[in-house]
Protein backbone atom coordinates (compact mmCIF):
# COMPACT_ATOMS: atom_id res chain seq x y z
CA UNK A 1 0.00 0.00 0.00
CA UNK A 2 2.81 2.41 1.26
CA UNK A 3 4.62 1.41 -1.99
CA UNK A 4 1.63 2.44 -4.57
CA UNK A 5 1.41 5.39 -2.55
CA UNK A 6 4.70 6.47 -3.20
CA UNK A 7 4.56 5.58 -6.64
CA UNK A 8 1.25 7.56 -7.24
CA UNK A 9 2.42 10.34 -5.06
CA UNK A 10 6.13 10.68 -7.36
CA UNK A 11 4.11 11.00 -10.13
CA UNK A 12 1.25 13.34 -9.53
CA UNK A 13 4.48 15.60 -8.24
CA UNK A 14 6.38 14.77 -11.28
CA UNK A 15 3.39 15.34 -13.01
CA UNK A 16 2.58 19.35 -11.81
CA UNK A 17 6.61 19.35 -11.92
CA UNK A 18 6.61 18.75 -15.73
CA UNK A 19 3.45 21.23 -16.52
CA UNK A 20 5.42 23.67 -14.66
CA UNK A 21 8.40 23.47 -16.47
CA UNK A 22 6.28 23.70 -19.41
CA UNK A 23 4.57 26.63 -18.51
CA UNK A 24 8.05 28.38 -17.47
CA UNK A 25 9.41 27.61 -20.89
CA UNK A 26 6.40 28.72 -22.76
CA UNK A 27 6.60 31.89 -20.05
CA UNK A 28 7.60 35.26 -21.27
CA UNK A 29 8.61 36.83 -18.17
CA UNK A 30 12.12 35.40 -17.66
CA UNK A 31 13.76 38.95 -17.18
CA UNK A 32 11.61 41.48 -16.62
CA UNK A 33 12.53 45.39 -15.97
CA UNK A 34 14.55 46.58 -13.06
CA UNK A 35 12.00 48.91 -11.30
CA UNK A 36 14.28 49.59 -8.67
CA UNK A 37 16.36 52.94 -8.60
CA UNK A 38 15.79 53.39 -12.07
CA UNK A 39 14.14 56.17 -14.08
CA UNK A 40 10.77 55.49 -14.42
CA UNK A 41 9.63 54.75 -17.67
CA UNK A 42 6.18 54.70 -18.90
CA UNK A 43 6.86 51.32 -20.26
CA UNK A 44 7.64 48.47 -18.87
CA UNK A 45 10.58 45.76 -21.31
CA UNK A 46 10.09 41.62 -20.46
CA UNK A 47 11.79 38.76 -21.79
CA UNK A 48 11.13 35.08 -22.33
CA UNK A 49 13.29 32.29 -24.29
CA UNK A 50 11.51 32.86 -27.47
CA UNK A 51 10.52 36.23 -27.48
CA UNK A 52 10.50 39.98 -25.75
CA UNK A 53 7.66 41.68 -24.64
CA UNK A 54 6.45 45.56 -23.91
CA UNK A 55 3.89 46.88 -22.09
CA UNK A 56 2.71 50.68 -22.05
CA UNK A 57 1.14 52.83 -19.48
CA UNK A 58 -2.10 51.97 -21.48
CA UNK A 59 -1.99 47.90 -21.03
CA UNK A 60 -0.91 47.64 -24.45
CA UNK A 61 1.19 45.08 -25.14
CA UNK A 62 3.68 44.32 -28.01
CA UNK A 63 5.96 40.86 -28.45
CA UNK A 64 7.97 40.33 -30.85
CA UNK A 65 9.57 36.65 -31.57
CA UNK A 66 13.44 36.09 -31.61
CA UNK A 67 13.25 35.17 -35.12
CA UNK A 68 17.01 34.36 -35.64
CA UNK A 69 18.73 31.75 -34.25
CA UNK A 70 22.35 32.16 -35.37
CA UNK A 71 21.82 36.02 -33.80
CA UNK A 72 21.28 34.85 -30.30
CA UNK A 73 23.64 34.34 -27.63
CA UNK A 74 24.82 31.09 -26.71
CA UNK A 75 23.33 31.09 -23.30
CA UNK A 76 20.01 31.56 -24.23
CA UNK A 77 19.95 29.27 -26.56
CA UNK A 78 21.75 26.62 -24.29
CA UNK A 79 19.01 27.66 -21.61
CA UNK A 80 16.62 26.79 -24.45
CA UNK A 81 18.10 23.38 -25.01
CA UNK A 82 17.93 22.59 -21.61
CA UNK A 83 14.43 23.19 -20.56
CA UNK A 84 13.50 21.34 -24.13
CA UNK A 85 15.37 18.54 -23.08
CA UNK A 86 13.48 19.05 -19.78
CA UNK A 87 10.54 18.92 -21.42
CA UNK A 88 10.91 15.91 -23.72
CA UNK A 89 13.15 13.34 -20.70
CA UNK A 90 9.74 14.61 -18.70
CA UNK A 91 7.11 13.91 -21.06
CA UNK A 92 8.56 10.06 -21.43
CA UNK A 93 9.05 9.96 -17.88
CA UNK A 94 5.07 10.60 -17.29
CA UNK A 95 4.31 7.97 -20.55
CA UNK A 96 6.67 5.14 -18.93
CA UNK A 97 5.64 6.08 -15.50
CA UNK A 98 1.21 5.57 -16.46
CA UNK A 99 2.25 1.82 -17.58
CA UNK A 100 4.39 1.15 -14.20
CA UNK A 101 1.71 2.65 -12.20
CA UNK A 102 0.97 -0.68 -9.85
CA UNK A 103 -2.41 0.62 -9.63
CA UNK A 104 -3.03 0.17 -13.71
CA UNK A 105 -2.87 -3.50 -14.75
CA UNK A 106 -1.91 -4.13 -17.99
CA UNK A 107 -2.35 -7.32 -19.62
CA UNK A 108 -0.15 -10.17 -17.63
CA UNK A 109 2.55 -7.51 -17.14
CA UNK A 110 5.40 -8.53 -14.53
CA UNK A 111 6.28 -6.98 -11.05
CA UNK A 112 10.11 -6.57 -12.10
CA UNK A 113 9.05 -4.97 -15.63
CA UNK A 114 6.72 -2.10 -13.79
CA UNK A 115 9.64 -2.04 -11.01
CA UNK A 116 12.21 -1.40 -14.18
CA UNK A 117 9.64 0.95 -15.51
CA UNK A 118 9.41 2.97 -12.48
CA UNK A 119 12.75 3.26 -12.14
CA UNK A 120 13.46 4.37 -15.29
CA UNK A 121 10.58 7.01 -14.99
CA UNK A 122 12.69 8.12 -11.72
CA UNK A 123 15.59 8.82 -13.31
CA UNK A 124 14.30 10.38 -16.34
CA UNK A 125 11.79 12.89 -14.12
CA UNK A 126 15.69 13.54 -11.73
CA UNK A 127 17.39 14.61 -14.62
CA UNK A 128 14.51 16.44 -15.96
CA UNK A 129 14.11 18.02 -13.15
CA UNK A 130 18.35 18.90 -13.30
CA UNK A 131 17.99 19.69 -16.74
CA UNK A 132 14.87 22.77 -15.83
CA UNK A 133 17.37 23.73 -12.57
CA UNK A 134 20.47 24.34 -14.78
CA UNK A 135 18.70 25.86 -17.96
CA UNK A 136 16.56 28.22 -15.09
CA UNK A 137 20.14 28.91 -12.98
CA UNK A 138 22.29 29.30 -16.27
CA UNK A 139 19.91 32.59 -16.91
CA UNK A 140 19.49 33.27 -13.65
CA UNK A 141 23.77 33.80 -13.67
CA UNK A 142 23.58 35.36 -16.82
CA UNK A 143 20.76 37.91 -15.70
CA UNK A 144 22.90 38.93 -12.34
CA UNK A 145 25.81 39.05 -14.45
CA UNK A 146 24.16 41.67 -17.15
CA UNK A 147 22.61 43.09 -14.04
CA UNK A 148 25.87 44.47 -12.34
CA UNK A 149 28.03 44.92 -15.78
CA UNK A 150 24.83 47.20 -16.80
CA UNK A 151 24.63 48.84 -13.57
CA UNK A 152 28.82 49.84 -13.61
CA UNK A 153 27.48 51.54 -17.21
CA UNK A 154 24.94 53.25 -15.40
CA UNK A 155 27.34 55.16 -12.98
CA UNK A 156 30.04 55.85 -15.45
CA UNK A 157 30.94 58.71 -17.58
CA UNK A 158 28.48 60.97 -16.27
CA UNK A 159 30.36 63.97 -16.39
CA UNK A 160 28.52 65.43 -19.50
CA UNK A 161 24.34 65.44 -20.22
CA UNK A 162 23.65 61.44 -19.95
CA UNK A 163 22.27 60.62 -23.87
CA UNK A 164 20.80 57.13 -22.29
CA UNK A 165 19.87 55.20 -19.57
CA UNK A 166 20.46 51.43 -19.88
CA UNK A 167 17.58 49.47 -19.06
CA UNK A 168 18.23 46.56 -16.52
CA UNK A 169 17.01 43.15 -16.19
CA UNK A 170 15.69 41.23 -12.61
CA UNK A 171 14.44 37.93 -12.41
CA UNK A 172 11.00 37.10 -13.72
CA UNK A 173 8.36 35.09 -12.42
CA UNK A 174 9.07 32.35 -14.69
CA UNK A 175 13.00 31.50 -13.09
CA UNK A 176 10.57 31.12 -9.96
CA UNK A 177 8.01 28.66 -11.42
CA UNK A 178 11.14 27.02 -13.18
CA UNK A 179 13.26 26.00 -9.83
CA UNK A 180 10.07 25.08 -8.38
CA UNK A 181 8.64 22.76 -10.76
CA UNK A 182 12.03 21.45 -11.07
CA UNK A 183 12.75 20.69 -7.87
CA UNK A 184 8.79 19.16 -7.46
CA UNK A 185 10.27 16.59 -11.07
CA UNK A 186 13.46 16.08 -8.64
CA UNK A 187 11.22 15.00 -5.79
CA UNK A 188 8.78 12.97 -7.73
CA UNK A 189 11.61 11.25 -9.44
CA UNK A 190 13.47 10.53 -6.32
CA UNK A 191 10.40 8.91 -5.06
CA UNK A 192 9.85 7.07 -8.25
CA UNK A 193 13.42 5.39 -7.65
CA UNK A 194 12.30 4.86 -4.00
CA UNK A 195 8.96 3.26 -5.30
CA UNK A 196 10.95 0.93 -7.07
CA UNK A 197 12.35 -0.85 -5.02
CA UNK A 198 9.48 -1.85 -2.85
CA UNK A 199 7.64 -2.72 -6.31
CA UNK A 200 10.87 -5.06 -7.13
CA UNK A 201 9.62 -8.72 -7.15
CA UNK A 202 11.28 -10.85 -4.23
CA UNK A 203 13.82 -13.64 -5.86
CA UNK A 204 13.22 -16.76 -3.85
CA UNK A 205 15.52 -19.57 -4.55
CA UNK A 206 12.80 -22.29 -4.01
CA UNK A 207 14.02 -26.07 -4.41
CA UNK A 208 12.25 -28.11 -6.61
CA UNK A 209 9.06 -30.16 -5.48
CA UNK A 210 7.36 -32.95 -6.96
CA UNK A 211 3.30 -32.59 -6.28
CA UNK A 212 1.41 -35.42 -6.80
CA UNK A 213 -1.75 -35.07 -8.21
CA UNK A 214 -4.25 -37.34 -9.06
CA UNK A 215 -1.55 -40.30 -10.02
CA UNK A 216 0.74 -38.21 -12.46
CA UNK A 217 3.14 -35.80 -11.42
CA UNK A 218 4.19 -32.48 -12.02
CA UNK A 219 7.61 -30.62 -11.47
CA UNK A 220 7.28 -26.69 -10.86
CA UNK A 221 10.82 -25.30 -11.10
CA UNK A 222 11.62 -22.19 -9.83
CA UNK A 223 10.31 -19.21 -11.54
CA UNK A 224 7.89 -20.78 -13.53
CA UNK A 225 4.94 -18.97 -12.78
CA UNK A 226 4.96 -15.49 -12.45
CA UNK A 227 3.88 -12.88 -10.13
CA UNK A 228 1.25 -11.38 -12.20
CA UNK A 229 -0.14 -15.56 -11.69
CA UNK A 230 -0.60 -14.43 -7.75
CA UNK A 231 1.67 -17.35 -6.99
CA UNK A 232 5.32 -17.48 -6.58
CA UNK A 233 7.19 -14.27 -5.45
CA UNK A 234 5.95 -12.76 -2.08
CA UNK A 235 4.00 -9.57 -2.79
CA UNK A 236 5.17 -7.66 -0.10
CA UNK A 237 8.83 -7.40 -2.10
CA UNK A 238 12.07 -6.98 -0.55
CA UNK A 239 15.22 -4.89 -2.07
CA UNK A 240 16.70 -6.22 -4.64
CA UNK A 241 17.88 -3.06 -7.24
CA UNK A 242 20.79 -1.50 -5.49
CA UNK A 243 20.96 0.55 -8.85
CA UNK A 244 17.99 2.46 -6.98
CA UNK A 245 20.41 3.69 -4.07
CA UNK A 246 22.57 4.65 -6.32
CA UNK A 247 20.73 6.90 -7.94
CA UNK A 248 19.76 8.59 -4.75
CA UNK A 249 23.63 8.99 -3.81
CA UNK A 250 23.89 10.40 -7.88
CA UNK A 251 21.01 12.81 -6.86
CA UNK A 252 22.51 14.11 -4.24
CA UNK A 253 26.33 15.15 -5.53
CA UNK A 254 24.80 15.97 -9.59
CA UNK A 255 22.95 19.63 -8.57
CA UNK A 256 26.08 21.18 -6.92
CA UNK A 257 27.44 21.36 -10.30
CA UNK A 258 24.54 23.27 -11.72
CA UNK A 259 24.48 25.77 -8.50
CA UNK A 260 25.23 29.04 -10.26
CA UNK A 261 23.29 31.57 -8.85
CA UNK B 1 -17.62 59.46 -30.37
CA UNK B 2 -15.23 59.95 -27.76
CA UNK B 3 -16.08 63.34 -25.52
CA UNK B 4 -14.39 65.00 -22.32
CA UNK B 5 -16.37 67.83 -21.20
CA UNK B 6 -15.06 69.93 -18.79
CA UNK B 7 -16.02 72.10 -16.00
CA UNK B 8 -16.58 76.00 -16.40
CA UNK B 9 -14.22 78.68 -15.87
CA UNK B 10 -12.87 79.45 -12.27
CA UNK B 11 -11.65 82.68 -10.23
CA UNK B 12 -9.77 81.96 -6.88
CA UNK B 13 -7.63 83.82 -4.74
CA UNK B 14 -3.85 82.72 -3.41
CA UNK B 15 -4.06 80.12 -0.78
CA UNK B 16 -7.18 78.46 -2.33
CA UNK B 17 -8.39 75.23 -3.45
CA UNK B 18 -9.78 74.82 -7.09
CA UNK B 19 -11.86 71.73 -8.39
CA UNK B 20 -12.30 70.89 -12.18
CA UNK B 21 -13.97 68.22 -13.28
CA UNK B 22 -13.86 66.07 -16.41
CA UNK B 23 -16.74 64.07 -17.69
CA UNK B 24 -16.26 61.52 -20.00
CA UNK B 25 -18.58 59.57 -22.93
CA UNK B 26 -18.32 57.34 -26.17
CA UNK B 27 -15.91 55.21 -24.26
CA UNK B 28 -15.51 52.51 -21.59
CA UNK B 29 -14.52 55.14 -18.63
CA UNK B 30 -12.79 52.30 -16.53
CA UNK B 31 -10.54 51.36 -19.32
CA UNK B 32 -8.34 54.73 -20.13
CA UNK B 33 -6.13 56.66 -17.87
CA UNK B 34 -7.16 60.64 -17.90
CA UNK B 35 -3.95 63.26 -17.45
CA UNK B 36 -4.30 66.46 -16.46
CA UNK B 37 -1.94 69.20 -18.54
CA UNK B 38 -1.50 72.59 -17.68
CA UNK B 39 -0.68 75.43 -20.11
CA UNK B 40 -0.09 78.64 -18.56
CA UNK B 41 -0.43 81.84 -20.75
CA UNK B 42 2.11 81.95 -23.64
CA UNK B 43 3.69 79.03 -21.97
CA UNK B 44 3.92 75.28 -23.28
CA UNK B 45 2.28 72.81 -21.54
CA UNK B 46 3.05 71.07 -18.41
CA UNK B 47 2.37 66.79 -17.62
CA UNK B 48 0.30 66.99 -14.34
CA UNK B 49 -0.65 63.86 -13.55
CA UNK B 50 -2.69 60.51 -14.35
CA UNK B 51 -5.18 58.53 -12.82
CA UNK B 52 -6.65 55.19 -13.83
CA UNK B 53 -10.56 55.53 -13.45
CA UNK B 54 -10.89 51.31 -13.08
CA UNK B 55 -8.49 51.57 -9.71
CA UNK B 56 -8.53 55.31 -8.76
CA UNK B 57 -4.92 54.98 -8.99
CA UNK B 58 -3.04 57.99 -9.54
CA UNK B 59 0.67 59.17 -10.70
CA UNK B 60 1.52 62.86 -9.84
CA UNK B 61 4.32 64.65 -11.38
CA UNK B 62 6.38 65.18 -8.49
CA UNK B 63 6.30 69.43 -8.98
CA UNK B 64 2.55 69.10 -7.99
CA UNK B 65 2.84 65.98 -5.32
CA UNK B 66 1.06 67.06 -2.21
CA UNK B 67 -1.16 69.87 -3.67
CA UNK B 68 -2.90 67.95 -6.71
CA UNK B 69 -5.45 65.46 -5.51
CA UNK B 70 -6.88 63.27 -8.67
CA UNK B 71 -10.37 61.35 -8.01
CA UNK B 72 -12.97 59.61 -10.46
CA UNK B 73 -16.83 59.01 -9.67
CA UNK B 74 -17.43 56.00 -11.86
CA UNK B 75 -21.32 56.96 -11.48
CA UNK B 76 -21.14 59.50 -13.21
CA UNK B 77 -17.88 58.86 -15.72
CA UNK B 78 -16.39 62.30 -14.04
CA UNK B 79 -12.75 62.96 -13.00
CA UNK B 80 -11.90 65.06 -10.74
CA UNK B 81 -8.41 67.50 -10.44
CA UNK B 82 -8.00 69.62 -7.16
CA UNK B 83 -5.29 71.79 -7.11
CA UNK B 84 -4.78 73.02 -3.66
CA UNK B 85 -2.09 76.05 -1.95
CA UNK B 86 -3.23 78.40 -5.23
CA UNK B 87 -0.50 80.66 -6.31
CA UNK B 88 -0.64 83.50 -8.91
CA UNK B 89 1.84 80.91 -10.67
CA UNK B 90 -0.90 78.46 -10.81
CA UNK B 91 -3.35 80.54 -13.85
CA UNK B 92 -3.28 78.39 -16.51
CA UNK B 93 -5.51 76.51 -18.55
CA UNK B 94 -6.38 73.03 -17.28
CA UNK B 95 -6.78 70.17 -19.68
CA UNK B 96 -8.22 66.76 -19.02
CA UNK B 97 -7.20 64.07 -21.84
CA UNK B 98 -7.74 60.80 -22.25
CA UNK B 99 -4.43 58.36 -23.11
CA UNK B 100 -4.47 56.24 -26.23
CA UNK B 101 -4.55 52.41 -26.12
CA UNK B 102 -1.26 51.04 -27.93
CA UNK B 103 -0.62 54.83 -29.04
CA UNK B 104 2.44 55.20 -27.34
CA UNK B 105 1.40 56.56 -24.48
CA UNK B 106 0.16 59.54 -25.92
CA UNK B 107 -3.57 61.25 -25.52
CA UNK B 108 -5.36 61.08 -27.88
CA UNK B 109 -8.32 63.28 -26.99
CA UNK B 110 -8.51 66.32 -24.58
CA UNK B 111 -10.95 68.31 -22.90
CA UNK B 112 -11.75 71.66 -23.86
CA UNK B 113 -10.00 73.36 -21.19
CA UNK B 114 -10.67 75.13 -18.26
CA UNK B 115 -9.54 78.48 -17.29
CA UNK B 116 -8.10 78.98 -13.87
CA UNK B 117 -7.22 82.29 -12.33
CA UNK B 118 -5.86 82.79 -9.93
CA UNK B 119 -5.20 86.69 -8.27
CA UNK B 120 -6.24 88.94 -5.20
CA UNK C 1 12.68 65.83 -15.61
CA UNK C 2 14.07 65.13 -19.62
CA UNK C 3 14.59 68.08 -20.90
CA UNK C 4 12.25 68.71 -24.34
CA UNK C 5 13.96 71.65 -26.82
CA UNK C 6 12.31 72.45 -29.51
CA UNK C 7 13.41 74.57 -32.84
CA UNK C 8 12.91 77.47 -33.95
CA UNK C 9 10.27 78.64 -31.30
CA UNK C 10 8.91 80.43 -34.43
CA UNK C 11 8.53 79.59 -38.29
CA UNK C 12 7.35 81.19 -41.13
CA UNK C 13 6.68 79.34 -44.17
CA UNK C 14 5.03 80.19 -47.80
CA UNK C 15 1.97 78.41 -48.84
CA UNK C 16 2.52 75.87 -50.66
CA UNK C 17 6.16 75.75 -49.15
CA UNK C 18 8.24 72.91 -46.71
CA UNK C 19 7.85 73.27 -43.42
CA UNK C 20 10.38 71.59 -40.87
CA UNK C 21 10.61 71.89 -37.18
CA UNK C 22 12.87 69.99 -34.70
CA UNK C 23 12.71 68.39 -31.14
CA UNK C 24 15.62 67.28 -29.25
CA UNK C 25 15.32 65.27 -25.96
CA UNK C 26 17.75 65.51 -23.09
CA UNK C 27 17.92 61.41 -22.74
CA UNK C 28 17.18 58.64 -25.94
CA UNK C 29 13.56 58.53 -25.91
CA UNK C 30 14.37 54.58 -27.70
CA UNK C 31 13.08 51.86 -26.20
CA UNK C 32 15.36 48.77 -27.13
CA UNK C 33 12.83 46.56 -25.71
CA UNK C 34 10.58 47.20 -29.39
CA UNK C 35 12.95 49.35 -30.96
CA UNK C 36 10.19 52.25 -31.06
CA UNK C 37 10.61 55.84 -29.88
CA UNK C 38 8.06 57.17 -27.66
CA UNK C 39 7.99 60.75 -28.83
CA UNK C 40 4.46 62.61 -29.59
CA UNK C 41 3.83 65.35 -31.56
CA UNK C 42 0.56 67.75 -31.29
CA UNK C 43 -0.87 70.34 -33.19
CA UNK C 44 -2.23 73.19 -31.17
CA UNK C 45 -4.65 75.80 -32.64
CA UNK C 46 -5.33 79.35 -31.19
CA UNK C 47 -7.77 78.65 -28.63
CA UNK C 48 -8.15 74.80 -28.79
CA UNK C 49 -6.91 72.05 -27.04
CA UNK C 50 -4.16 70.01 -28.67
CA UNK C 51 -4.39 67.44 -31.02
CA UNK C 52 -2.48 63.83 -31.28
CA UNK C 53 -0.75 64.08 -34.85
CA UNK C 54 2.22 61.70 -34.49
CA UNK C 55 2.95 59.02 -31.66
CA UNK C 56 6.35 56.60 -31.73
CA UNK C 57 7.88 59.51 -33.28
CA UNK C 58 6.35 58.42 -36.88
CA UNK C 59 2.76 56.85 -36.87
CA UNK C 60 0.79 59.26 -37.68
CA UNK C 61 -2.83 59.30 -36.06
CA UNK C 62 -5.64 58.06 -37.78
CA UNK C 63 -7.56 61.90 -39.78
CA UNK C 64 -3.79 63.77 -40.13
CA UNK C 65 -3.65 64.67 -43.48
CA UNK C 66 -0.20 62.83 -45.28
CA UNK C 67 1.43 65.92 -45.89
CA UNK C 68 2.48 65.33 -42.32
CA UNK C 69 5.42 63.28 -41.42
CA UNK C 70 7.48 62.63 -38.06
CA UNK C 71 10.59 61.18 -38.47
CA UNK C 72 14.24 60.73 -35.46
CA UNK C 73 15.24 58.35 -33.51
CA UNK C 74 17.03 58.35 -29.97
CA UNK C 75 16.91 62.06 -28.86
CA UNK C 76 16.44 64.01 -32.63
CA UNK C 77 13.12 64.46 -33.75
CA UNK C 78 11.71 66.13 -36.92
CA UNK C 79 8.16 67.04 -38.10
CA UNK C 80 7.58 67.87 -41.35
CA UNK C 81 4.71 69.55 -43.38
CA UNK C 82 5.78 69.40 -47.01
CA UNK C 83 2.99 71.62 -48.68
CA UNK C 84 1.79 74.13 -46.13
CA UNK C 85 -1.93 75.01 -45.92
CA UNK C 86 -3.83 77.60 -44.01
CA UNK C 87 -5.61 75.43 -41.81
CA UNK C 88 -1.78 74.30 -39.96
CA UNK C 89 -0.92 77.25 -38.82
CA UNK C 90 -1.03 76.58 -34.96
CA UNK C 91 1.63 75.90 -32.25
CA UNK C 92 3.51 72.40 -32.68
CA UNK C 93 4.51 70.51 -29.23
CA UNK C 94 6.67 67.56 -28.89
CA UNK C 95 6.27 65.48 -25.98
CA UNK C 96 8.17 63.02 -23.74
CA UNK C 97 6.48 59.83 -23.55
CA UNK C 98 8.64 57.59 -22.24
CA UNK C 99 9.80 58.70 -18.72
CA UNK C 100 8.07 60.50 -15.82
CA UNK C 101 6.99 63.20 -15.76
CA UNK C 102 5.84 63.71 -19.24
CA UNK C 103 7.27 66.67 -20.45
CA UNK C 104 7.24 68.49 -23.38
CA UNK C 105 8.85 71.16 -25.66
CA UNK C 106 8.20 74.89 -25.43
CA UNK C 107 6.24 74.86 -29.21
CA UNK C 108 7.10 75.70 -31.99
CA UNK C 109 4.56 78.61 -33.71
CA UNK C 110 4.03 77.93 -37.52
CA UNK C 111 3.08 81.05 -39.47
CA UNK C 112 2.17 82.22 -43.15
CA UNK C 113 4.95 83.95 -44.63
Known amino acids: MAVTACQGLGFVVSLIGIAGIIAATCMDQWSTQDLYNNPVTAVFNYQGLWRSCVRESSGFTECRGYFTLLGLPAMLQAVRALMIVGIVLGAIGLLVSIFALKCIRIGSMEDSAKANMTLTSGIMFIVSGLCAIAGVSVFANMLVTNFWMSTANMYTGMGGMVQTVQTRYTFGAALFVGWVAGGLTLIGGVMMCIACRGLAPEETNYKAVSYHASGHSVAYKPGGFKASTGFGSNTKNKKIYDGGARTEDEVQSYPSKHDYV | QVQLVQSGAEVKKPGASVKVSCKAS????????IHWVRQAPGQGLEWMGR????????YYNEKFTGRVTMTRDTSTSTVYMELSSLRSEDTAVYYC?????????????WGQGTTVTVSS | DIVMTQSPDSLAVSLGERATMNCKSS????????????LTWYQQKPGQPPKLLFY???TRESGVPDRFSGSGSGTDFTLTISSLQAEDVAVYHC?????????FGGGTKLEIK
Open chain 2, 97 to 109: AREGYGKGNSMDY
Open chain 2, 26 to 33: GYIFTNYW
Open chain 2, 51 to 58: IYPGTGNT
Open chain 3, 27 to 38: QSLLNAGNQKNY
Open chain 3, 56 to 58: WAS
Open chain 3, 95 to 103: QNAYYYPYT
